[in-house]
């Protein structure tokens, strides 16, 4: 028997489904009590689902798991994870049990979308150019960890002066907090970019000084 | 070319535990299905228990459940047995053994260890 | 657990012969057996699996057949090289488990 998963890694995002392919080629005559199939957490080998002698043993994970019963005799081995967490991340393996065995481990990458980012001055009033200014873009609920990117009112990078700290929720998704420490020209525009790597996602949020009144 | 080399003899007293290793080179280890068979003097082949080590559970014989112990370490592509509460019934031949990958066949046998077993 | 039961303990029969080797499941083991060939001093060698196919580099002379409970192994003509005991294995489909006939010893007349 020869187990075929995907290459590239499964990407789903927190509280939506996700499917680990997983197929294999059942010889003619091929029937399910012949099938023994074992999903498992390809670093701990903590079973995860299992279909022996015939049935569906059902799920040894949190009860989020399920296969595709109707597709199994086809050689559809794939395992459903119901409301994907954060904490499912990782390498699953998916190992088949016929006349032979063969396994193949596939990955699941875990995402969330980060929030818009809001942005705060401090001082935020009498400003004037010269004076020296904390610009905090924040962001919020995201995962993985965000790339955040500085720039001015012409594009130009701002790298100097750039404090970033992430911190994980109980539900382990990033608050993002990024601070910007400037000198104020005679007017000008902030922004900051909240990149996800894994969705490839940007959420921006700028502020610009135009003397007085600010807008954000 | 398969190669299975097992730890050399060994003599135990009553009681105590041996535990015999087999290094295993020729393939991906972590995809073969590994074998412990003893035989004792003059006697026939008994299986005690076996493991797939990229599945991770080792499956035992009912005469050798709870004094047997087999695990497999996928760095070193090496397995163990362990047999405690040694009596002078357990002097014998171990083996370990494989087949091809993916394959439940036993049909490559290491050198084999001689447990003796004596007060 | 499966038994296997091999007769004859000892098959006694001279070079050029043919041999029939019996082996019997208390319950029926699909086609999931294996003989096996054992010399004094040496590991066992697979000869047949999955009930009748040869193993690599076995003379045709070894032959398998059976299901269910009842199997057999076949010389069809003994050579001198093939004077040992032999062992009939069955593996269960799940978990991965594996029992041993008693043998059958195969001596020169």
């Known amino acids: 028997v020869e187990v075929q998963v995907s290459e590239d890694p499964v990407v789903a995002l927190v509280d939506t489904d996700a499917t680990l392919r997983c197929s294999f080629s059942p010889e003619p005559g091929f029937s399910l009590a012949q099938l023994n199939l074992i999903w498992q957490l390809t670093d701990t080998k903590q079973l995860v689902h299992s279909f022996t002698e015939g049935r569906d043993q059902g799920s040894a994970y949190s009860n989020r798991t399920a296969l595709f019963p109707d597709l199994l005799v086809q050689g559809n081995a794939s395992l459903r994870l119901q409301r994907v967490r954060v904490t499912d991340e990782g390498s699953y393996t998916c190992f088949v049990s016929i006349q032979d065995f063969d396994s193949a481990a596939v990955s699941l990458q875990v995402a969330a979308p980060y929030s818009k980012p809001s942005m705060t001055l401090e001082p935020n009033k009498d400003l004037r150019p010269g004076n020296m200014v904390t610009i905090t873009c924040s962001s919020y609920q995201g995962y993985p960890e965000a790339e955040v990117f500085w720039k001015d009112g012409q594009g130009v990078p701002l790298t100097g002066n750039v404090t970033t700290s992430q911190m994980a929720n109980e539900r382990g998704l990033f608050d993002v907090h990024s601070v910007l420490r400037v000198v104020l020209g005679a007017n000008g525009t902030y922004s900051c970019l909240v990149r996800n790597p894994v969705l490839q996602q940007d959420a921006h949020g700028s502020v610009t000084i135009t003397g007085q009144p600010l807008t954000f | 070319e398969v190669q299975l080399v097992q730890s050399g003899a060994e003599v135990k007293k009553p009681g105590s535990s041996v535990k015999v290793s087999c290094k295993a080179s020729?393939?991906?280890?972590?995809?073969?299905?590994i074998s412990w068979v003893r035989q004792a003097p003059g006697q026939g082949l008994e299986w005690m228990g076996g493991i797939i080590p990229i599945f991770g559970t080792a499956n035992y014989a009912q005469k050798f459940q709870g004094r047997v112990t087999i695990t497999a370490d996928e760095s070193t592509s090496t397995a163990y047995m362990e047999l405690s509460s040694l009596r002078s019934e357990d002097t014998a031949v171990y083996y370990c053994?494989?087949?091809?990958?993916?394959?439940?066949?036993?049909?490559?046998w290491g050198q084999g260890t001689l447990v003796t077993v004596s007060a | 657990e499966i038994v296997l039961t091999q007769s004859p303990a000892t098959l006694s029969l001279s070079p050029g012969e043919r041999a029939t080797l019996s082996c019997r499941a208390s319950q029926s083991v699909s086609s999931y057996l294996a003989w096996y060939q054992q010399k004094p001093g040496q590991a066992p060698r697979l000869l047949i699996y999955?009930?009748?196919n040869r193993a690599t580099g076995i003379p045709a002379r070894f032959s398998g057949s059976g299901s269910g409970t009842d199997f057999t192994l076949t010389i069809s003509s003994l050579e001198p090289e093939d004077f040992a005991v032999y062992y009939c294995q069955q593996r269960s489909n799940w978990p991965p488990m594996y029992t041993f006939g008693q043998g059958t010893k195969l001596e020169i007349k």
């Open positions: 999955d009930a009748s």
């Open positions: 020729g393939g991906t280890f972590s995809s073969y299905a």
């Open positions: 053994a494989r087949g091809e990958r993916g394959s439940y066949l036993i049909d490559y």
